[in-house]
């Protein structure tokens, strides 16, 4: 499987769109910052088989998509940017799905790293809980936007490492 330059371009576009989505100054939200305990070890990419790493990346994209496609999210962000963001994420998920199939074969079930997938899910649960507790305030969304950009950067770095392995 070759995570192509196109995929890399999608990653950059996703981050660019997230940057453009900002609506308020993050400096008015310093007190709202929160440690969501990003599962960084799951993105170090050394201990994984390639299929497992791709599965973790796919879960990251899926959870990001879920988070930003809620009713509360639609109210918080610019609709046009959000639509473009969905398209980029959807494209990345498709690329990753194709890669998983290629890596493990159509007939086989991917050797999923269940613990890693669960760690990503729990990470997003913490984010969702934070947003609920903060009543989906503009600052809460701004903190989450910065957090997701940071985690997408980790995803991008893992994908770069996977490409180098090809």
């Amino acid at each position: 499987c070759n995570l192509s330059q196109t995929h890399s371009l999608n990653n950059r576009r996703t981050l660019m769109l997230m940057a453009q989505m900002r609506r308020i100054s993050p400096f008015s939200c310093l007190k709202d910052r929160h440690d969501f305990e990003f599962p960084q070890e799951e993105f170090d990419g050394n201990q994984f088989q390639k299929a497992q790493a791709i599965s973790v990346l796919h879960e990251m994209m899926q959870q990001t998509f879920n988070l930003f496609s809620t009713k509360n999210s639609s109210a918080a962000w610019d609709e046009t940017l959000l639509e473009k963001f969905y398209i980029e994420l959807f494209q990345q998920m498709n690329d990753l799905e194709a890669c998983v199939i290629q890596e493990v074969g159509v007939e086989e079930t991917p050797l999923m790293n269940e613990d890693s997938i669960l760690a990503v899910k729990k990470y997003f649960q913490r984010i969702t809980l934070y947003l609920m507790e903060k009543k989906y305030s503009p600052c809460a969304w701004e903190v989450v936007r910065a957090e997701i950009m940071r985690s997408l950067s980790f995803s991008t770095n893992l994908q770069k490492r996977l490409r180098r392995k090809d």
């Epitope: 950059r12 981050l15 660019m16 940057a19 453009q20 100054s25 993050p26 400096f27 939200c29 310093l30 007190k31 910052r33 929160h34 440690d35 305990e37 903190v143 910065a146 957090e147 950009m149 940071r150």
Partner: antibody, heavy 120, light 111 residues
Framework: QVQLQESGTVLARPGASVKMSCKAS????????MHWVKQRPGQGLEWIGV????????TYNQKFKDKAKLTAVTSANTAYMELSSLTNEDSAVYFC?????????????WGQGTTVTVSS | DIVLTQSPASLAVSLGQRATISCRAS??????????MHWYQQKPGQTPKLLIY???NLESGVPARFSGSGSGTDFTLNIHPVEEEDAATYYC?????????FGSGTKLEIK
Amino acid sequence: QVQLQESGTVLARPGASVKMSCKASGYSFTTYWMHWVKQRPGQGLEWIGVIYPGNGDTTYNQKFKDKAKLTAVTSANTAYMELSSLTNEDSAVYFCTRNYKYDYYTMDYWGQGTTVTVSS
Amino acid sequence: DIVLTQSPASLAVSLGQRATISCRASKSVSTSGHSYMHWYQQKPGQTPKLLIYLASNLESGVPARFSGSGSGTDFTLNIHPVEEEDAATYYCQHSGELPFTFGSGTKLEIK
């Protein structure tokens, strides 16, 4: 690779204004906040303020609110800082620095610094 | 403004020994799990270099002999074992609230 190229040494008279530049390369200029930091000879570092080149948003240290003006021209990948009503206290090295890790607000890449000397 | 007090102002440490630099904030710079304190190294005639972010996270490419610890108002930078190339001035910086401020610096000399 990431580079921040600052303008050269400036000699200015008290009361005058100076505008220094910081040309960025090797990364997406519009999506990273750019900080400016002051260092007086043999002294520590002072945070002046920060600009988001993507839309020109700025946040200043109140101490420098009437002293410094931060701007950016995205087509030139360049950030600028203008210092007005110069006094001897403004003689210093001024660094532009790229924001790092989003809302952690650390600084990873630094320009080489612009030396401003105020003298009559 | 949050004042960061660094101590000592200067110290001389023998090669291979431990250097400990302290940074005390006039107000807590920790919130919800993160401590917004960072450490930089500046060698004479050079620009500052980020060593540690969020109190204890080693920046990529920085040798593991550098470590940071602390939370709330009290933070420490440790260098062990000290090497010749570590001779520099070290600054702490907080990003807990506006304005961000730096400590006054600690000059490390290698004996």
